[in-house]
Interface confidence: low
């Protein structure tokens, strides 16, 4: 907006109240201890047009509606949405004075949502889409993801639940070792009318710590007129791509699909290779011929003991007093090792070792050569699928009026902040700066260069 | 290893109740929900019911609904479902199910990866 | 009757390619997700297919599932003498509220 150049010398001017040099408790009495940097909160305002705002900093709910709708897919007593919501600071705020809106309860379902300042209409503005999320205590099972919900004229936000029609779902998602950041837009088939969810592909990037690491971390969903799509962590790209190519199902179905009244011909020949059919048995191959013969070229060891056995009665043996010939039939002593074989090479019959045939050569098989029938794997005929639509211009998807939060977790204290949702990435960008920049800025502030950074961060303003 | 382990066989005769367990290890059962399918002889699929581990909260199938009660003992981490007024067209084999994956709508409550054995329950005067 | 309908037979021969359809309304395949489920005799169903076309890790992508409008489909491509078993569709129905299957399709793999 015009007034756009005037805001870089107020956020400067800003910046001095922001960063201001305290000396702690120890300083005062070690002049050798430099003063720490502290920031100070002040609460982002909108540098343009808006459709959608809230920093939470009133210290109030109002503008959220909370949901007394029943869930529709449990028992009446047990499916309200009973999960309590509170804006407060967080736990370990380093920025008193910075509200949010915090999940407070575990293992309920959560509802609340709020009216945009007007729809967004998909046209020719691009849609971005940004708030921050502090799992202050952790996630074990549960989403912060949001909902922009459907401009239909049903829609009524005191009865918002889980199926309340949405046109665009975004956001973070974890339960066990699955972490999730959720992109999903319903589309609606243009042939049928009937919406279908569209997932985008999962992001390369490790999403784990932004999960675990107890840091806000800022989420943001930027969706262009030419279809493409962009989601940042902290600023940071961690997955893009295009409506029309990288999404599940596929915005667009195949143009063709297999015939399903197609059949394989009964004589298609799907056989690469067969057996020669001109081949013939050689006359010298002995197909009876064993794989194994006794080694002819052995001698018997010296020393073998022919007449020995291996195994002989055990001579300290005795019969037990109490064996019965009748019942227990004609006592034998148990067998032991011969110990005349222990210094011998070998006791007993002397067999030849077996060795391979030099002759064998089992069963003839006709070798394989190139099935001059072969057609190929047969694949039935592709057809015009019936079903065929092509929506080339999928950004246009169903305008939405209301923002919403229905969740469920099994973990307390999740904190909201800085919701924000405009058609101008500059605006989205200084709110961002100016309110999860802060917090970024305090969970830093003992580290050199975090107030150059700042400053640096208000000059690059146009 | 994740699995799901059912009580044994049971023979009852009309009119009374059954009460099936499901013993689940190897995950967070309070992070699942679980449901439990039947299939009489010869016949296809029925769905139940469901249970959601983490709160316990519960729903039914229209066609069951006053006769099943579905349970659960987080520190047993075990689910009960328990079918009351048997009949003979009763006589089924009852299996727990868990989902694939997580306790919301759009986490799709019909995608079962986890199965019971399987619990034969007959009905017969 | 099943809310999903299904063939009751499909059959097809070593290397083949075969396809289940199964058929529903806006209230259940029209609106929700489609799942399938492989059972072999005297075991507990195998989820083969999850959101209409997605597999589940270690199942082979000889399946493949699909879905258009009402109706659902199930494909085996290079078709085996183990993938002998009854097939099952699935979905939740809204006028319901509930998860209806369908009556199964045995599949036969001939010679």
């Known amino acids: 907006h015009d007034g756009h150049d005037d805001d870089a010398i107020d956020i400067e001017d800003d910046l001095d109240d922001v960063i201001e040099e305290v000396e702690d408790s120890k300083s005062k009495s070690d002049a050798s201890t430099p003063p720490s940097p502290k920031v100070t909160y002040k609460a982002p305002v909108p540098t343009g047009e808006v459709y959608f705002a809230d920093s939470f900093d009133r210290g109030s709910l109002s503008g959220w509606i909370l949901s007394k709708a029943k869930k529709d897919d449990t028992d009446d007593e047990i499916a309200k949405y009973d999960g309590k919501w509170e804006v407060d600071e967080m736990k370990e705020t380093k920025l008193p004075g910075d509200k949010g809106l915090v999940l407070m309860s575990r293992a309920k379902h959560h509802a609340i949502s709020a009216k945009l300042n007007k729809p967004f209409l998909f046209d020719t503005k691009p849609l971005i889409v940004q708030y921050e999320v502090n799992f202050q205590n952790g996630i074990e099972c549960g989403g912060a993801y949001v909902k922009l919900l459907s401009k239909t004229a049903e829609l009524s936000l005191d009865q918002f639940h889980d199926k309340t029609p949405y046109t665009i779902m975004f956001g973070p998602d974890k339960c066990g070792e699955d972490y999730k950041l959720h992109f999903i837009f319903r589309h609606k088939n243009p042939k049928t009318g009937v919406y279908e969810e569209k997932h985008a592909k999962r992001p390369d990037a490790d999403l784990k710590t932004y999960f675990t690491d107890k840091k806000t971390h800022l989420y943001t969903l930027i969706l262009n007129p030419d279809n493409s799509f962009e989601i940042l962590v902290d600023q940071s790209v961690v997955n893009s791509g295009n409506l029309l190519n990288d999404m599940t199902p596929p915005v667009n179905p195949s143009r063709e699909i297999e015939d399903p009244e197609d059949r394989k011909p009964e004589d298609w020949d799907e056989r690469p290779k067969i057996a020669d059919p001109d081949a013939v048995k050689p006359d010298d191959w002995d197909e009876d011929a064993p794989s194994k013969i006794p080694d002819e070229e052995a001698t018997k060891p010296e020393g073998w003991l022919d007449d020995e056995p291996e195994y002989i009665p055990d001579p300290d043996a005795e019969k037990p007093e109490d064996w019965d010939e009748d019942m227990d039939g004609e006592w034998e002593a148990p067998q032991i090792a011969n110990p005349k074989c222990e210094s011998a090479p070998g006791c007993g019959v002397w067999q030849r070792p077996m060795i391979d045939n030099p002759n064998y050569k089992g069963k003839w098989k006709p070798p394989m050569i190139d099935n001059p029938n072969y057609q190929g794997i047969w694949k039935p005929r592709k057809i015009p699928n019936p079903d065929f639509f092509e929506d080339l211009e999928p950004f246009k998807m169903t305008p939405f009026s209301a923002i919403g939060l229905e969740l469920w977790s099994m973990t307390s204290d999740i904190f909201f902040d800085n919701f924000i949702i405009s058609g101008d990435r500059r605006v989205v960008d200084d709110w961002a700066n100016d309110g999860w920049g802060l917090k970024k800025a305090a969970d830093g502030a003992a580290e050199p260069g975090v107030v150059l950074q700042m400053l640096e961060a208000a000059e690059e303003r146009p | 290893e994740v699995q799901l382990v059912q009580s044994g066989a049971e023979v009852k005769k009309p009119g009374a109740s059954v009460k099936v367990s499901c013993k689940a290890s190897g995950y967070t059962f309070t992070s699942y929900a679980m449901h439990w399918v039947r299939q009489a002889p010869g016949q296809r699929l029925e769905w139940m019911g469901w249970i959601n581990a983490g709160n316990g909260n519960t729903k039914y199938s229209q066609k069951f609904q006053g006769r099943v009660t579905i349970t659960r003992d987080t520190s047993a981490s075990t689910a009960y479902m328990e079918l009351s007024s048997l009949r003979s067209e009763d006589t089924a084999v009852y299996y727990c199910?868990?989902?694939?994956?997580?306790?919301?709508?759009?986490?799709?409550?019909?995608?079962?990866?986890?199965w019971g054995q399987g619990t034969t329950v007959t009905v017969s005067s | 009757q099943s809310v999903l309908t299904q063939p009751p037979s499909a059959s097809g021969t070593p290397g083949q390619r075969v396809t289940i359809s199964c058929s529903g309304s806006?209230?259940?395949?029209?609106?929700?997700?489609v799942y399938w489920y492989q059972q072999l005799p005297g075991t507990a169903p195998k989820l083969l297919i999850y959101i209409n076309d997605q597999r589940p890790s270690g199942v082979p992508d000889r399946f493949s599932g699909s879905k258009s409008g009402t109706s659902a489909s199930l494909a085996l491509s290079g078709l085996r003498s183990e993938d002998e078993a009854d097939y099952y569709c699935?979905?939740?129905?809204?006028?319901?509220?509930?998860?209806?299957f369908g009556g199964g399709t045995k599949l036969t793999v001939l010679g």
């Open positions: 699935a979905a939740w129905d809204d006028s319901l509220s509930g998860l209806v």
């Open positions: 806006s209230s259940n395949i029209g609106t929700n997700y």
């Open positions: 199910a868990r989902v694939l994956h997580v306790l919301r709508y759009f986490d799709w409550p019909g995608a079962f990866d986890i």
